[in-house]
């Protein structure tokens, strides 16, 4: 059954009217408008864009559109004292310097205020020393270096290739290894797809291209100076020494031309295996230090960036609900970019703009959604999800009582192969039903549904005939809504073929070459993938805001809880002796999952049968659905991560981008064999099983009959 039939929701003509109003040509026009100059967070240009969006959303017909400002910690390079890295000889003379900025793309030579590549929030410093190549700087890479190869990174400058994990995790790992500086670079193995030309002739990264990005380890805190609370006019700010998540060692990013010059001289140990080799014509020696003739040469970093409290602006638009105005469905995506933001974020912002326009058109014709829809253009996402987090902190009491769902809308595309969806299990059925009603934009799937092309190209690893839907991790603005507040969340975009393109993200990510032309020439000339993403995101918002019964299926949560329990049990069972010694049992967790499954099944039966014309019962059932995600929140949060409060999902402690299931248990078990006090370590595993079992049981009980 479609969700419409299953829950007697939106009359189809309304949804159809909304979807039919979405136009690819408008998305194209909006993207062009949003990408002609840089819109870096905290700059005048981004403030002006905020005011433009506010004005246009009002014109489109929203009931109100307000700017919400906060004063948060941002980071910028010093305009007169540029950041760079040198090779110095024994006399201290700089014999090689890395590039100060990327050569501008054609047509953008005269654009001012292009921020040069930098690692946001790097401290200042001029460390010099021997280089150690640490592959991707993942946890396992440092294990390989320190435990297997006996290489000590203490007092060294490490060079790591971008990719696989969030850059902030790389820096954290390097700090823990004792490094005194980090150089991040884009290796062609990860950012240059074979058979594709480099920009401006294709979508590959040129040798002078560099990925910008923040290197924080905020763990959901938002503004580093005001964790837990909004950075408003009367905020109490921590001193910089107490700020959350700031790196303690200088960090700087470079392109592969510059990396070649640093890596070609490397001596010391050979790479441990082929997985440590990229595509440059260098040996990928680990070091430490340079080889023979060059052994007296050192690497020196020159980092002069500054951290500054700066005003940022969210745009918040409201379309009031006709029946349940106190129930909020939120569509949000960021507006700030590193440079032009051709993909990140403006391909998403342009889609949001068109969705707002379509909703506004329906509203002008007399229609209103059942529930209130909030639209958000977030600021300072690139600096640590700051705009969304501060707004959610300011409005947390309203959100935790009224928040139905959050749909994220960053980059609409990271490729043009198939759909990619990450969401709460509550939304699986919504996504399935919606994509069955939408046309596929893919070549070879003319006249077929999006569900069909998506399932064919990205099949679920568990369920045949169904598409892959991934866990939510972090690294985007849904984080505070899902991981902290427990509001059901989802995201959708078009992606690449992960089988054939093993590079990380898309090659021009966060570089100056992420332009309108990149999208218009190489990714989506007809803007048909953008339109499809608009239909998916907009369609989800429409259903969530307009269905009589919320389109959430709690049975899908039961299925994944069982899968996650099996997985974490398997991990633990790699230590059968210790489990026996310390009496570690997962019985309570499996029992809670079993109870959840039974209660969810009964709830779903009641959901089919109850009297939908009774507004009190309808509201009661909807509240049980709305508050189910909330029930997975532990008010105490995860160990050492108080703002990651969801017991079922959290960003991986080793990669912020990835989601981990039963993260409390997972982290307690991680590398447990190396713990100095095994009794204490297994005691923590038992405590985390207890917390997880209790939370699942408590969540199950929210679905029981109320009396």
């Amino acid at each position: 059954k479609s969700s419409n039939e299953a829950t007697n929701i939106t009359p189809k003509h309304n949804m159809k009217a909304f979807l039919d109003e979405l136009k690819a040509e408008n998305i194209k026009k909006f993207l062009y408008n949003f990408t002609q100059i840089p819109h870096l967070a905290g700059t005048e240009q981004n403030f002006q864009l905020a005011k433009q969006i506010q004005s246009q959303w009002k014109e489109f017909g929203l009931d109100s559109v307000e700017l919400a400002h906060y004063d948060v910690l941002l980071s910028y390079p010093n305009k007169t004292h540029p950041n760079y890295i040198s090779i110095i000889n024994e006399d201290g003379n700089e014999i090689f310097n890395t590039s100060l900025f990327e050569p501008p793309p054609p047509g953008y030579e005269n654009v001012s205020d292009i921020v040069p590549p930098f690692s946001a929030f790097s401290p200042q410093g001029m460390p010099e020393g021997d280089l150690v190549y640490v592959n991707y700087a993942r946890t396992e890479d440092f294990f390989k270096l320190e435990r297997d190869m006996k290489i000590n990174c203490s007092g060294k400058i490490v060079i790591a290739r971008y990719g696989k994990v969030f850059r902030g995790n790389k820096v954290k790992n390097a700090q823990l290894a004792g490094a005194k500086g980090v150089i991040l670079y884009s290796d062609p193995a990860d950012y240059f797809a074979p058979g594709v030309k480099s920009y401006p002739d294709g979508w590959n990264l040129p040798g002078g291209g560099v990925q910008r990005g923040n290197i924080l380890n905020l763990n959901g805190a938002g503004d580093p100076l005001t964790p837990g609370y909004p950075a408003n006019e009367y905020a109490y700010r921590r001193g910089i020494a107490e700020a959350v998540g700031l790196p303690s060692i200088p960090v700087h990013p470079i392109g592969y031309y510059d990396a070649q010059k640093l890596l070609e001289k490397m001596g010391g140990s050979a790479p441990p295996d082929s997985s440590w080799r990229g595509s440059l014509k260098v040996p990928y020696n680990v070091g430490p230090g340079f080889t023979g003739n060059f052994s007296t040469q050192k690497v020196k970093m020159h980092i002069h960036s500054t951290n500054e409290v700066t005003r940022i602006y969210n745009v918040i638009g409201t379309l009031r609900g006709a029946v349940e105005p106190d129930r909020y469905v939120i569509l949000g995506g960021h507006r700030d970019s590193w440079v032009f933001g051709g993909i990140d974020p403006q391909s998403g912002a342009a889609v949001v703009h068109e969705i707002v326009r379509s909703f506004g058109t329906l509203k002008k014709e007399g229609w209103r959604p059942r529930r209130t829809i909030l639209f958000a253009s977030w600021d300072a996402e690139e600096f640590g999800l700051l705009g969304s987090t501060e707004w959610a902190e300011e409005n947390s009491r309203l959100l935790q009582e009224r928040g139905v769902a959050y749909i994220n809308a960053d980059s609409s595309i990271e490729g043009n192969y198939t759909l990619r969806v990450d969401c709460t299990p509550l939304m699986y059925s919504l996504v399935h039903n919606l994509t069955k009603e939408l046309k596929s934009p893919d070549e070879g799937f003319e006249g077929k549904s999006l569900y069909e092309s998506w399932t064919k190209k990205s099949p679920s690893p568990e369920f045949s005939g169904m598409p892959r839907i991934s866990k939510l991790g972090s690294g985007n603005d849904f984080e505070v809504f899902f991981q902290r507040l427990g509001i059901a969340s989802g995201r959708a975009r078009y992606t690449k073929n992960w089988e054939t393109n093993k590079f990380s993200g898309y090659p021009l990510y966060h570089s100056v070459y992420e332009t309108y032309e990149l999208v218009e020439k190489f990714y989506d000339p007809m803007f048909k993938y953008h339109l499809t993403v608009a239909q998916v995101r907009g369609g989800m918002v429409f259903e969530l805001a307009n269905s009589i019964v919320l389109p959430f299926d709690c049975r899908d949560y039961a299925v994944v809880l069982r899968k996650y329990a099996d997985k974490i049990y398997s991990i633990s069972m790699k230590h059968p002796q210790e489990m026996k010694t310390y009496s570690v049992s997962f019985d309570s967790l499996f029992s809670a999952v079993k109870n959840f499954t039974e209660i969810a099944s009964k709830f779903s039966e009641r959901l089919q049968d109850f009297d939908k014309s009774n507004p009190i019962v309808l509201r009661m059932m909807n509240d049980q659905l709305m508050f189910l995600e909330r029930a997975f929140i532990d008010p105490l949060g995860l160990p050492d991560r108080p703002f990651y409060r969801h017991v079922i999902y959290a960003p991986s402690s080793h990669n912020k981008y990835a989601g981990e299931s039963f993260p409390g248990i997972y982290d307690a078990l991680f590398d447990i064999e190396s713990k100095v006090d095994p009794s204490k370590a297994w005691g923590e595993v038992k405590r985390q099983i207890y917390v997880a079992a209790f939370t699942v049981q408590a969540a199950a009980e929210t679905l029981s009959e109320v009396a």
Epitope: S99, F101, P103, P104, P106, E109, D201, P206, Y257
Partner: antibody, heavy 120, light 107 residues
Framework: DVKLVESGGDLVNLGGSLKLSCAAS????????MSWVRQTPEKRLELVAA????????YYTDTVKGRFTISRDNAKNTLYMQMSSLKSEDTALYYC?????????????WGQGTLVTVSA | DIVLTQSPATLSVTPGDSVSLSCRAS??????LHWYQQKSHESPRLLIK???QSISGIPSRFSGSGSGTDFTLSINSVETEDFGMYFC?????????FGGGTKLEIK
């Protein structure tokens, strides 16, 4: 061995037209951006026009925009420049040169040049 | 357009001397600066790329330095074959431009 050989230079009247050619050999011509660089009688070097490897993107310096057209025939391994509405300041030795970095140009390989003289 | 100003216009030296040629950009060009040598009736020849990176086949007495707007080509102990014109070129932003040249002549 990489070789670039220009031809087509001549004495031409003010306002006249001329087509220069550059025959390339010793490398995969279709894999490289190419440029025309001219050297004035005063020995100044000036980049005139560039073309991408497929021939679908062209770039011109302001002084020749609308008058000169750079093109290429990858099947024939040949670079061209059609020059029209020639001015006396177009008098120069015209070199074809191969880019070593895609769009962003520095030049290892140059031809020997072909002389264009525009007379009143 | 980015203007590259080379100085001096002419430099008269004795073989064995060490010399420095200057190239100044009208705006920052990072390290996207290259040096060429041109002898009479010959095409330009690349000496140094990206400020300081040596080119195979070019003698090690040629070296480059600088960053941003100010760059230097140094010739350590000039030899007779080094006399001719020297040009700098930027590849930072279109149109790629050359300096006016420095003529290195025998004193």
């Amino acid at each position: 061995d990489v070789k670039l050989v220009e031809s087509g230079g001549d004495l031409v009247n003010l306002g006249g037209s001329l087509k220069l050619s550059c025959a390339a050999s010793g490398f995969t011509f279709s894999g490289y951006y190419m440029s025309w660089v001219r050297q004035t009688p005063e020995k100044r070097l000036e980049l005139v026009a560039a073309i991408n490897s497929d021939g679908d993107n062209t770039y011109y310096t302001d002084t020749v925009k609308g008058r000169f057209t750079i093109s290429r025939d990858n099947a024939k391994n040949t670079l061209y420049m059609q020059m029209s509405s020639l001015k006396s300041e177009d008098t120069a030795l015209y070199y074809c040169a191969r880019h070593e970095d895609g769009y962003w140009a520095w030049f290892v390989y140059w031809g020997q040049g072909t002389l264009v003289t525009v007379s009143a | 357009d980015i203007v590259l100003t080379q100085s001096p216009a002419t430099l008269s030296v004795t073989p064995g001397d060490s010399v420095s040629l200057s190239c100044r950009a009208s705006q920052s060009i990072s390290n996207h600066l290259h040096w060429y040598q041109q002898k009479s009736h010959e095409s330009p020849r690349l000496l140094i790329k990206f400020v300081s990176q040596s080119i195979s086949g070019i003698p090690s007495r040629f070296s480059g330095s600088g960053s941003g707007t100010d760059f230097t080509l140094s010739i350590n102990s000039v030899e007779t074959e080094d006399f001719g014109m020297y040009f700098c070129q930027q590849s930072n932003s279109w149109p790629w431009t050359f300096g006016g040249g420095t003529k290195l002549e025998i004193k």
